[in-house]
């Protein structure tokens, strides 16, 4: 379906508002350090150009690819070399290498200040004074901090952001109305960003076969009544959408996502009985709703898989004729029967089945060789079941903060070379699995927990790739996507690690501790805990608990003192000395 002008085609399909929003997101994700005003100027220039192409598709430059147009525009930024260093070298390349170069320079951990939320009245005034600028600023600030955020979904977040201000700035108690909504958007946004980052990592590091396998498993769980051919069609379309978004082709991605939503709503009868309420909604909400839709009910009386995948004499013939289709059908059949399994477990089972067929179909008696293949599945199923059970019991016993601390200790002992801020961020997020998943009914715990852990561990992998410090992390991150979590779970205390020298400065605290929020206090204490473990990796739980209890007592005492700073100066060295003695 070729068009004389790609930019005109996308402008007409998406409409001006979405076009401008997506171009702003694209530019902000590529040039993460540029000021807002610079991006707005670039977007306005691109939009005016797009309008000339809509008026006359054969006008000059209208036939150029979007990568060429956008890349040329980015390369006009005057301060490119000073701000981005070697990223400026991308501009010497031709497409498609130039776009690949920009993609490689996306920074998952940009050195940007944390977003500070102004007073509610200040925000409401800014919203009323210039709503358009206010919303563009939101897109810009989120996109530059999350360079792989799923762009069409970010437009949905912006629409909710706008709705929250429109409603709450009229309310009697603006803050009571607005702040919970903003907190919810922030938390959902972070989760959405992390989930999308895993999809992009899957596509970029492991290829579209890995992503398609993930999608077959997930969509088969969601749509167990759909035929395999229907699931395959959805998987193909979804893979195209995410490949485009992960590749920076945000206009094509948003357009194709809208087409996919349209197709799903036109074909509900052959997909799922749960789509109805999504399909009545406007586009952005509809696409979001379809992505989050609950699993349909499993058809009754599904037969055992043994007949087709073990007992049949044609297993090797069917496998040899079309390996990926046969494995895809296996995965579909397994997944539609098991919404209680994590997607990662289902992929491990498919991988084990594939390995057995590769071995057995070359054997003298293939049938005899693969006859007991499903016995190999039992330990694969029971390992995450036991892990979820044990960790949920620990979470219920300790509560979230102490559960996070247990994970901090566990992961610092496994990979002590990883930077302290990364260990704190990742372990805190790993610890959130408890509140998120352990309260769920048993049938939903494993898919919630293990697939969430995959998302969090991907964050560790992405940060570690930027600054690699641990061979063990590199190995777990790169060897197998589906075995990342079991790989990290299996890591033990790193015996080769040379303990970090004690640095009193790391354990020196001041009166500013007292004015921190509860979350910030926790992060400070957890940072100290990681440093303690790096200093004494063989410290026992009891020793560490003792030191942390003393730390909490010392901070509480000084924060109650009249002269807080004097208290910290006097009690701090005592705490450090006592801690060293306790860990000696």
């Amino acid at each position: 379906d070729t068009h004389k002008s790609e930019v005109a085609h996308r402008f007409k399909d998406l409409g001006e508002e979405h076009f401008k929003g997506l171009v702003l997101v694209a530019f902000s994700q590529y040039l993460q350090q540029c000021p807002f005003e610079e991006h707005v100027k670039l977007v306005n220039e691109v939009t005016e150009f797009a309008k000339t192409c809509v008026a006359d598709e054969s006008a000059e430059n209208c036939d150029k690819s979007l990568h060429t147009l956008f890349g040329d525009k980015l390369c006009t930024v005057a301060t490119l070399r000073e701000t981005y260093g070697e990223m400026a070298d991308c501009c010497a390349k031709q497409e498609p290498e130039r776009n690949e170069c920009f993609l490689q320079h996306k920074d998952d951990n940009p050195n940007l200040p944390p977003l500070v939320r102004p007073e509610v009245d200040v925000m409401c005034t800014a919203f009323h004074d210039n709503e358009a600028t206010f919303l563009k600023k939101y897109l810009y600030e989120v996109a530059r901090r999350h360079p792989y955020f799923y762009a069409p979904e970010l437009l949905f977040f912006a629409a909710r952001y706008k709705a929250a201000f429109a409603e709450c700035c009229q309310a009697a108690d603006k803050a009571a109305c607005l702040l919970p909504k903003l907190d919810e958007l922030r938390d959902e946004g972070k989760a959405s960003s992390a989930k999308q980052r895993l999809k992009c990592a899957s596509l970029q590091k492991f290829g579209d076969r890995a992503f398609k396998a993930w999608a077959v498993a997930r969509l088969s769980q969601k749509f167990p009544k759909a035929e395999f051919a229907e699931v395959s069609k959805l998987v193909t379309d979804l893979t195209k959408v995410h490949t485009e978004c992960c590749h920076g082709d945000l206009l094509e991605c948003a357009d194709d996502r809208a087409d996919l939503a349209k197709y799903m709503c036109e074909n509900q009868d052959s997909i799922s009985s749960k789509l109805k309420e999504c399909c009545d909604k406007p586009l952005l909400e509809k696409s979001h709703c379809l992505a989050e839709v609950e699993n349909d009910e499993m058809p009754a009386d599904l037969p055992s898989l043994a007949a087709d995948y073990v007992e049949s004499k044609d297993v090797c013939k069917n496998y040899a004729e079309a390996k990926d289709v046969f494995l895809g059908m296996f995965l579909y059949e397994y997944a539609r029967r098991h919404p209680d399994y994590s997607v990662m477990l289902l992929l491990r089972l498919a991988k084990a089945y594939e390995a057995t067929l590769e071995k057995c179909c070359a054997a003298a008696d293939p049938h005899e060789c693969y006859a007991k293949v499903f016995d190999e599945f039992q330990p694969l199923v029971e390992e995450p079941q036991n892990l979820v059970k044990q960790n949920c019991e620990l979470f219920e016993q300790l509560g979230e903060y102490k559960f996070q601390n247990a994970l901090l200790v566990r992961y610092t002992k496994k990979v002590p070379q990883v930077s302290t801020p990364t260990l704190v961020e990742v372990s805190r997020n790993l610890g959130k699995v408890g509140a998120k998943c352990c309260k769920l009914p048993e049938a939903k715990r494993m898919p919630c927990a293990e697939d969430y852990l995959s998302v969090v561990l991907n964050r560790l992998c992405v940060l570690h790739e930027k600054t690699p410090v641990s061979e063990k992390v590199t190995k777990c991150c790169t060897e197998s996507l589906v075995n990342r979590r079991p790989c990290f779970s299996a890591l033990e205390l790193d015996e080769a690690y040379v303990p970090k020298a004690f640095n009193a400065e790391t354990f020196t605290f001041h009166a500013d501790m007292c004015t921190l929020s509860e979350k910030e206090k926790q992060v400070k204490k957890q940072t100290a805990l990681v440093e303690l473990v790096k200093h004494k990796p063989k410290a026992t739980k009891e020793q560490l608990k003792g030191v942390m209890d003393n730390f909490a007592a010392f901070v509480e005492k000084c924060c109650k003192a009249d002269d807080k700073e004097a208290c910290f100066a006097e009690e701090g060295p005592k705490f450090v000395a006592a801690s060293q003695a306790a860990l000696a």
Partner: nanobody, 116 residues
Framework: EVQLVESGGGLVQPGGSLRLSCAAS????????LAWYRQAPGKQRDLVAR???????YYADSVKGRFTISRDNSKNTLYLQMNSLRAEDTAVYYC??????????WGQGTLVTVSS
């Protein structure tokens, strides 16, 4: 294979309650759907309630609002809580397990008699 053993049947007055249990053993890791069926004297075996691996439940119209099916995977046990029992609920109740890798399994049945 999966083995199933029912318990909890007995004689109960109309309006009373009973709780049936079904203990599964063997290849329980492979179970996806569990169900209760019943067979009244001289009748065919009918589905009473079903619970899938995802936790979704289905009830026959005749027991909706009175019976509750549940499963405890950690104990490998299926339950059927039966309230407001009626004479027409008298039957042998069978536990059924649908497996992903093995043939379906049936228990030997437990008799429930509702009579005054």
């Amino acid at each position: 294979e999966v083995q199933l053993v029912e318990s909890g049947g007995g004689l109960v007055q109309p309006g009373g309650s009973l709780r049936l249990s079904c203990a599964a053993s063997g290849s329980t890791w492979s179970i996806n759907t569990l169900a209760w069926y019943r067979q009244a004297p001289g009748k065919q075996r009918d589905l009473v309630a079903r619970i899938s691996s995802g936790g979704s439940t289905y009830y026959a119209d005749s027991v909706k609002g009175r019976f509750t099916i549940s499963r405890d995977n950690s104990k490998n046990t299926l339950y059927l809580q039966m309230n407001s029992l009626r004479a027409e609920d008298t039957a042998v109740y069978y536990c059924y397990a649908q497996s992903t890798w093995y043939p379906p399994s049936w228990g030997q049945g437990t008799l429930v008699t509702v009579s005054s």
